[in-house]
């Protein structure tokens, strides 16, 4: 059967994500590009109530309808495009991307022919210095009272998806409390999704600035021509050099049989909303895609009998569970998956300083991608965490 997103239900450029329907089945959610909204992004917003702007960007009602009020230097329906220079002004000064740490560059008529509009927490002519007091202070508390009631309801409420609201109590960050909690540079969560190298945020604690500082950045993805092929041939016992890259998941270590394993500390534990037998049927695809996202090698942890550690995840039972349901046993709605991270090829690559040293840092990275709505993974994840390594139990 086709997965819900395979029929491409989202219109007008909307992004399709798998989610869990009311009955426990797999359904889809469309993340629409403004001004479109609706179940399939089929409707056009007529008021600010219907328009979803990115977190922190207000909606403005104009004569031509609602629009996102982009900050200086940004444009486009979702304020994701660096605005072109005013007509007549040269853009050459901005061509070298002089503004650091997510600052936007505006061409001006006098030397040096550009002005940087710095991201919160950064200052200086090129946004090179952390400002003592961030221009926009970190939200110490969650400003919206309604968010308190929505925390932990397994639904990512975008208006609550802020650090102050704990990323909607973890609902938007795969239940990772704060993916950036180890990061000392305050604004890195704002800069994580800007496709620019922010050196202050490129440390492991700051989740490598979403790989923006590495050659090709995170735009270096597995060639679509190879992608399906690499998933089919992942860990199939044949070395495929075209798939033996970090962005294609290192071919499931097929080309590394002579290289000794280098396991990251701990176990990466994912809750996936697919039952074990269904997940294991597409295990190679699942592992290849996740390996490509984390740019290292992943495999299932094995128990003492050599079986993959993929366990049933049951629907959390409310008190008023029907007697019939109880007699049938708890309903399996997903899998708890335990993964090992093998950095043998990541650490051998030319840029070998961006490997996840432990499972928790990999979990934080996945949580961060989810929080900024950039986790491009077709398997529905409920939560992710790193756990310390214990020897598999003998049975």
């Amino acid at each position: 059967a086709l997965s819900p997103c395979e029929s491409q239900p989202c219109q007008h450029g909307g992004q399709c994500r798998h989610s869990l329907g009311r009955g426990g089945g797999l359904t889809f959610t469309c993340h629409c590009v403004p001004p479109f909204w609706g179940l399939r992004c089929e409707r056009v917003a007529r008021s600010c109530r219907e328009l979803q702007c990115p977190v922190g960007i207000p909606c403005q009602q104009t004569a031509r309808g609602p629009r996102c009020a982009c900050p200086p230097g940004l444009s486009g329906p979702s304020c994701r495009v660096s605005r072109a220079s005013p007509s007549g002004a040269t853009n050459a000064s901005c061509a070298s991307a002089p503004c650091l740490h997510g600052g936007s560059c505006l061409p001006v008529q006098s030397v040096p022919f550009f002005r940087c509009v710095c991201a919160p927490g950064w200052g200086g002519p090129r946004c090179e210095t952390p400002s003592a007091a961030p221009e926009v202070p970190e939200e110490p508390r969650c400003p919206r009272a309604a968010c308190q009631a929505k925390r932990g309801d397994q639904n990512c409420d975008r208006e609550c998806n802020t650090p102050g609201c704990g990323w909607d109590g973890g609902d938007c960050s795969l239940n990772v409390d704060d993916p950036w909690r180890q990061c000392e540079a305050l604004q890195c969560w704002r800069l994580f999704n800007n496709s620019r190298c922010d050196p202050a945020c490129s440390s492991p604690a700051c989740l490598y600035d979403n790989f923006d500082c590495y050659s090709g950045g995170r735009d270096r993805t597995c060639n679509p021509v190879y992608e399906k092929y690499c998933a089919d041939h992942f860990a199939d016992g044949r070395c495929d050099q075209g798939c033996n890259t970090e962005e294609c998941g290192w071919d499931g270590l097929d080309c590394a049989s002579e290289v000794p394993a280098l396991l990251a500390r701990g176990v990466l534990v994912l809750t996936v909303l697919l039952p074990p037998e269904e997940l294991l049927r597409s295990s190679a695809d699942f592992l290849q895609r996740l390996s490509a996202i984390l740019r290292t090698s992943l495999r299932f942890r094995l128990d003492a009998r050599g079986q993959a550690m993929v366990f049933p995840y049951h629907r959390p039972s409310p008190g008023s569970e029907s007697r019939v349901r109880r007699e049938l046993g708890p309903e399996v709605i997903g899998s708890v998956v335990m993964l090992e991270i093998d950095n043998r090829l990541c650490l051998q690559s030319a840029e070998n300083d961006h490997c996840f040293p432990d499972a928790q840092s990999a979990a934080d990275y996945l949580g961060a991608l989810s929080a900024v709505e950039r986790l491009d993974f077709p398997y529905p994840l409920r939560d992710v965490r790193g756990e310390p390594l214990e020897a598999p139990e003998q049975s």
């Epitope: 089919d232 992942f234 860990a235 199939d236 016992g237 044949r238 070395c239 499931g252 097929d254 080309c255 049989s257 294991l280 049927r281 597409s282 295990s283 190679a284 699942f286 592992l287 495999r299 299932f300 094995l302 050599g306 079986q307 993959a308 993929v310 090992e340």
Partner: antibody
């Protein structure tokens, strides 16, 4: 040395079942993708299916003629590969080989075991 | 499924002859083609992998070429021990498939 030994072949009636085993020795069996290939008397080679290592889910793929009837499994604690054959047909009569796939193509094959399906 | 067609299905040759066997895939398989040699009552033996790579321990008189859909196995100077059946096999997509075989006999 690296060795694969198949067993379990024999005479079976159409509609019957049979389980073939392939005992592996001389290498770390659990890390390898394993294949079954068959050859009908006087005919060419036919790929039956394969199974990945359990660390990658232990998922199996099958050729169309056997899909739904044959099941490949492995027991890494016993270093053994299995082929469970159900609803056997006369056209399943063949020598069945197990084979180890190797990244650098140092393939290893067993000597084969004959399965005869006849009434 | 990807169909593999070998030609000829059989050939007669003498020791010292140059022998060429071709294999055609029903769709492009890049260079994912292997050549096997099989003697009666024995398991197949891998000669060439990934279209043109000689398996270790295989004499250099065997060579492979081609990519996409058309492939060739060449034996530059046939030896007595080379009389056997040769199979091509694609491992580009499951189900992996073999050609029907080419039997090389003594003239």
């Amino acid at each position: 040395q690296v060795q694969l030994v198949e067993s379990g072949g024999g005479l079976v009636k159409p509609g019957g079942s049979l389980r073939l085993s392939c005992a592996a020795s001389g290498f770390t069996f659990s890390t390898y993708v394993m294949h079954w290939v068959r050859q009908a008397p006087g005919k060419g080679l036919e790929w039956v299916g394969r199974i990945r290592a359990n660390a990658y889910g232990g998922a199996a793929d099958y050729a169309a003629p056997v899909k739904g009837r044959f099941t490949i499994s492995r027991d890494d604690s016993k270093n053994t590969l299995y082929l469970q054959m159900n609803s056997l047909k006369t056209e399943d009569t063949a020598v069945y080989y197990c084979a180890r796939a190797e990244a650098r193509y140092r393939d290893v094959w067993g000597q084969g075991t004959l399965v005869t399906v006849s009434s | 499924d990807i169909q593999m067609t070998q030609s000829p299905s059989s050939l007669s040759a003498s020791v010292g002859d140059r022998v060429t066997i071709t294999c055609r895939a029903s769709q492009s398989i890049s260079s994912h083609l292997n050549w096997y040699q099989q003697k009666p009552g024995k398991a197949p033996k891998l000669l060439i992998y990934a279209a043109s790579n000689l398996q270790s321990g295989v004499p250099s008189r065997f060579s492979g070429s081609g990519s996409g859909t058309d492939f060739t196995l060449t034996i530059s100077s046939l030896q007595p021990e080379d009389f056997a059946t040769y199979y091509c096999q694609q491992d580009y997509h499951t189900p992996f498939t073999f050609g029907q075989g080419t039997k090389v006999e003594i003239k």
